[in-house]
């Protein structure tokens, strides 16, 4: 599973991060690192 | 939805190759770097290889350093592990993470 | 490489209680633009790791708020605040500020 199931009482949203501290900077620039929507937002 | 699928996994003899591939979705993979982590029967989790977005910088362990080897290919959403040299210890169950998101893995059993 | 260290190794807990995992780093976690990436998954049996907490403190989406995280530097902490049947499972903190990416060695949640 790569989300979180329904049925185990977490909501399933879409949300991607920058994960690695080494990818901040290569990725449009975020600091936060939140993805949502494929649009990368502070 | 993100979603990381690996495939490729078997029973091996010691000294023999595998290949596993990791198909993703959801996401702009190209933006992101990935790894391969491995958990063993004792359930501890090692990195194994890792890759920056572009593929122009990896990173191996020494347990694994010149017989494993990490790509990527952009253009396909997909994640690689080369195994080659394969030894009774590299039996573990093994990942493709983008470290929010995990496969569900893939099994390696190296046994003659 | 960053040694994660994580206690207990087992955590017996009555449902309803509230449970607390610690994880100690050995430099800290704290990286160049300020940010801190320590980060907790929770793996059930039989399926991968599942992000919880990220970067400290942040509930990975769709996590319940009875999860938490807390700390700083190289001394880290999760808590659930009342423990559900479904949370039962092996924790697990990890790095992502320095490469390689490390693990603690989990911290297993059961029924006393």
């Known amino acids: 599973d790569a989300e979180f199931r329904h049925d185990s009482g977490y909501e399933v949203h879409h949300q991607k991060l920058v994960f690695f501290a080494e990818d901040v900077g290569s990725n449009k620039g975020a600091i936060i690192g939140l993805m949502v929507g494929g649009v990368v937002i502070a | 939805e993100v979603q990381l699928v690996e495939s490729g996994g078997g029973l091996v003899q010691p000294g023999g190759s595998l290949k596993l591939s990791c198909a993703a979705s959801?996401?702009?993979?190209?933006?992101?770097?990935m790894s391969w982590v491995r958990q063993t029967p004792d359930k501890r989790l090692e990195l194994v290889a890792s890759i920056n977005s572009n593929g122009g910088s990896t990173y191996y362990p020494d347990s694994v350093k010149g017989r494993f080897t990490i790509s990527r290919d952009n253009a396909k959403n997909t994640l690689y592990l080369q195994m080659s040299s394969l030894k009774s210890e590299d039996t573990a169950m093994y990942y493709c993470?983008?470290?929010?998101?995990w496969g569900q893995g893939s099994t390696l059993t190296v046994s003659s | 490489d960053v040694v994660m260290t994580q206690t207990p190794l087992s955590l017996p807990v009555s449902l309803g209680d509230q449970a607390s995992i610690s994880c100690r780093s050995s430099?800290?976690?704290?990286?160049?633009?300020?940010?801190?990436?320590l980060h907790w998954y929770l793996q059930k049996p039989g399926q991968s790791p599942k992000l919880l907490i990220y970067k400290v403190s942040s509930r990975f989406s769709g996590v319940p708020d009875r999860f938490s995280g807390s700390g700083s530097g190289t001394d880290f902490t999760l808590k659930i605040s009342r423990v559900e049947a479904e949370d039962l499972g092996v924790y697990f903190c990890?790095?992502?500020?320095?490469?390689?990416?490390?693990f603690g060695g989990g911290t297993k949640l059961e029924i006393k």
């Open positions: 993470a983008s470290g929010d998101y």
């Open positions: 430099q800290s976690l704290v990286y160049s633009n300020g940010d801190t990436y």
């Open positions: 959801g996401f702009t993979f190209s933006s992101y770097g």
């Open positions: 990890s790095q992502s500020t320095h490469v390689p990416w490390t």
